[in-house]
């Protein structure tokens, strides 16, 4: 059987087994034929007439081979005493099995008194004369455990006490737990313990490309079965479990930490160039921030903010903008403002002085608006608003920015206060307003800011007009919009008017004129 190592198997011996018998006229070495008329060797005894039989049949010396406990599998036939006339009282239907340990072969010098009895063995099925037809003999198989053993070898002996008996085969074996891999730990084969209840602890070795999660151990039972697995190994980073082994992650897959999990496909915008990848490298122009986990997609810096508008009020300017159209795959966008003063021309600019004040701050702005104060009067300024995310500082490319140029003055136009709707269509709205009460100079243009209601922070649009009326096109039907208007002079932009809400017309239903 599996997990069994034979020390002796007489069924593989051709001819006499060469065992010792004592006394004479006890056990006989006899060649028989089996059910298929193949020759088989047996030892037989049938001294059923005389009482007090004591016939011994002893095996040759069997080396122990490191086994602490062995098993004897005896195949035998035993004749029913009732089938033999006139022997009741002297005929027996059992025999005894004994063993003797020794460190060397003792030859013929063993004595009955040295042997230890293992058990008395009876047949599960004895047979009568009526059962003898065409060699249909009732074969009995009995297994007995012997142990604990400590010497280099041993003998087994059969003691006949008056039975009609044939020993057809003897197999002596020990059990071992076979080498196996369990929980990614390799356990080498282990010989079972010395008694029927003992468990032998065996420590496992993690298979290639795996590491201990908890010390892997199993226990080898007396029956040659592995029991109670404790602890385990897990595949290392870059490897996944497949059929009791750890296999490298394939190209395009990765595993970042040791564990039970399988290799995962590389996140978006990344790749693995070699097997057994622990992380996936970002594609060209894509990056992973220091705190991004390996499972995160690679991202890139954002594009420039859009719709940057300025509102000059004397020596202050309010800047407003919309988020970039491409956030680079990230949500951690902030804004930086760069202020440049251009005394002579826009091509010759310098950094603004330290006296310039930015509200709330100049860098890491979370909101898309900024007040810049303490500017010089009647001075040209260029403001750059750059969008920044968690990987902007990893890119060697210059940052994208929106630019607006302004000239400070002492007074910008006042607020446009009267604004009304002239007409509203499905996709356009016409507006009409009055010039500010204090233009403070020649009004160069008007700027209309509009956006879907409640969506100003997401996106807004602007439109320029040189008169006090304008039609805004490209709107969505049936949608409520917010409109604001402001004036611009050479001194800068005034404040936006109060918001005015207008709803575009709903689309007309189409009527089916077919009958």
């Amino acid at each position: 059987g599996r997990g069994e190592v034979n020390l002796l198997d007489t069924s593989t011996i051709h001819g006499d087994w060469g065992w010792l018998t004592y006394p004479a006229h006890g056990w006989d070495s006899i060649n028989e034929v089996d059910e298929s008329f193949r020759p088989i060797h047996t030892y037989q005894v049938c001294n059923v007439m005389s009482p007090n039989q004591n016939n011994w049949l002893r095996t040759n010396w069997v080396p122990r081979d490191g086994a602490r406990r062995v098993y004897a599998e005896i195949k035998f036939t035993l004749r029913d005493c009732n089938s033999i006339p006139g022997v009741l009282g002297t005929c027996k239907e059992t025999f005894n099995l004994h063993y003797l340990e020794s460190d060397r072969d003792l030859g013929a010098s063993t004595q009955e008194s040295q042997f230890l009895k293992i058990d008395t063995i009876a047949a599960d099925e004895s047979f009568t004369g009526a059962d003898l037809g065409v060699r249909r003999l009732k074969l009995n198989t009995e297994v007995r455990g012997v142990g604990p053993l400590s010497k280099r070898g041993f003998y087994l002996a059969f003691q006949d006490i008056g039975a009609c008996l044939a020993i057809l085969s003897l197999r002596i074996y020990y059990k071992k737990c076979p080498a196996m891999v369990r929980n990614l730990a390799a356990f080498s084969e282990a010989v079972t313990g010395a008694d029927s209840s003992s468990l032998v602890e065996v420590r496992g070795q993690c298979v290639r490309h795996s590491e201990e999660r908890d010390t892997p151990k199993m226990y080898c039972s007396a029956e040659g079965e592995w029991l109670v697995p404790i602890g385990k190994c897990v595949c290392s980073a870059g490897y996944e479990e497949r059929r009791d082994a750890c296999m490298a992650c394939e190209l395009g897959f990765y595993k970042s930490a040791p564990g039970d999990q399988l290799c995962a496909r590389c996140p978006p915008h990344s790749h693995s160039a070699t097997p057994a990848a622990q992380t996936c490298r970002c594609d060209l122009s894509y990056y992973r921030a220091a705190l991004d986990p390996p499972s995160a997609a690679c991202t890139r810096p954002p594009s420039a903010p859009v719709n940057l508008i300025s509102s000059v009020n004397g020596t202050s300017v309010t800047l407003e903008w919309a988020p970039p159209l491409d956030p680079g795959g990230r949500s951690d966008i902030t804004y930086n403002a760069v202020c440049r003063r251009c005394p002579w021309a826009l091509s010759h600019c310098e950094a603004c002085g330290s006296g310039t004040r930015f509200v709330p701050q100049q860098t890491s702005l979370a909101q898309a608006s900024l007040l810049v104060a303490n500017l010089l009067a009647h001075m040209n300024y260029s403001f750059w608003i750059e969008a920044v995310n968690g990987v902007s500082n990893l890119s060697p490319e210059p940052r994208s920015a929106a630019v607006v140029n302004i000239t400070t003055n002492q007074a910008a136009p006042s607020q446009v206060v009267v604004i009304r709707q002239e007409r509203a269509g499905q996709t356009s709205v016409s507006l009409l307003w009055q010039e500010p009460e204090q233009p403070n100079g020649i009004i160069l243009e008007y700027e209309i800011k509009y956006y879907e209601k409640d969506k100003e922070m997401q996106s807004y649009s602007t439109l320029k007009a040189v008169t006090t009326r304008a039609t805004v096109s490209g709107l969505k039907p049936g949608t409520r919009y917010v409109f604001q208007v402001r004036a611009r002079t050479s001194a800068g932009c005034g404040r936006f008017s109060q918001a005015m809400e207008v709803e575009t017309g709903k689309p007309r239903p189409r009527y089916d004129t077919r009958t």
């Epitope: 049938c46 007439m49 004749r79």
Partner: antibody, heavy 121, light 106 residues
């Protein structure tokens, strides 16, 4: 060497008795039963019965009760067949044969050379 | 009592030929059957017991089979020393012999 030794030929008158000995050697006499077989001149074999050499208990075949007696002297490993009131039809060779019981079956495995008993007036 | 009938009464064969002897019981004897060989002036000799098991020292040209009521003794290639009378014998509670088959030279 296992053997059974019988006495020489006997000539007896009708009505007389004869005691045929069978001496065993080469094995433990009490470990095997002893059987007796008759063979009339030119005829086949007839089983007369057997005796348990350990208990001395005899078993007789049909037609061999009454005048035929099996006995033992274990001290000299000898079995005996005694026939009384001899008749002419008792003229035959009488064989003793050792009975062998085995796991696989029984048989008479060792035979004496036979004793010819002639009954003639 | 169980009656054993052997056939044929006489079997004539040449040396080297196959000889087949039959023994039929009046009722089942299972495998409790033995075969004996007797040569003129000699005691019988046990050939087979248990219907098919060779006795000690019997050559393997002798083989036997059967169970219940029909039994066969076969001599695969008859040798000169095999010419003799062959008896079957059953051993139940009471033992009986067949009347014998004489194997003679053809």
């Amino acid at each position: 060497q296992v053997q059974l030794l019988q006495s020489g030929a006997e000539v007896k008158k009708p009505g007389a008795s004869v005691k045929v000995p069978c001496k065993a050697s080469g094995y433990t006499f009490t470990s095997r039963a002893m059987s007796w077989v008759r063979q009339a001149p030119g005829q086949g074999l007839e089983w007369m019965g057997w005796i348990n050499t350990n208990t001395g208990n005899p078993t007789y075949a049909q037609g061999f009760t009454g005048r035929f007696v099996f006995s033992l002297d274990t001290s000299v490993s000898t079995a005996y067949l005694q026939i009384s009131s001899l008749k002419a039809e008792d003229t035959a060779v009488y064989y003793c044969a050792r009975v062998r019981f085995t796991v696989y079956g029984d048989g008479m495995d060792v035979w004496g050379q036979g004793t010819l008993v002639t009954v003639s007036s | 009592e169980i009656v054993l009938t052997q056939s044929p009464a006489t079997l004539s064969v040449s040396p080297g030929e196959r000889a087949t002897l039959s023994c039929r019981a009046s009722q089942s004897v299972s495998s409790n059957l033995a075969w004996y060989q007797q040569k003129p002036g000699q005691a019988p000799r046990l050939l087979i017991y248990g219907a098919s098991t060779w006795a000690t020292g019997i050559p393997d040209r002798f083989s036997a089979s059967g169970s219940g009521t029909d039994f066969t003794l076969t001599i695969s290639r008859v040798e000169p020393e095999d010419f003799a009378v062959y008896y079957c014998q059953q051993y139940g509670p009471s033992w009986t012999f067949g009347q014998g088959t004489k194997v003679e030279i053809k």
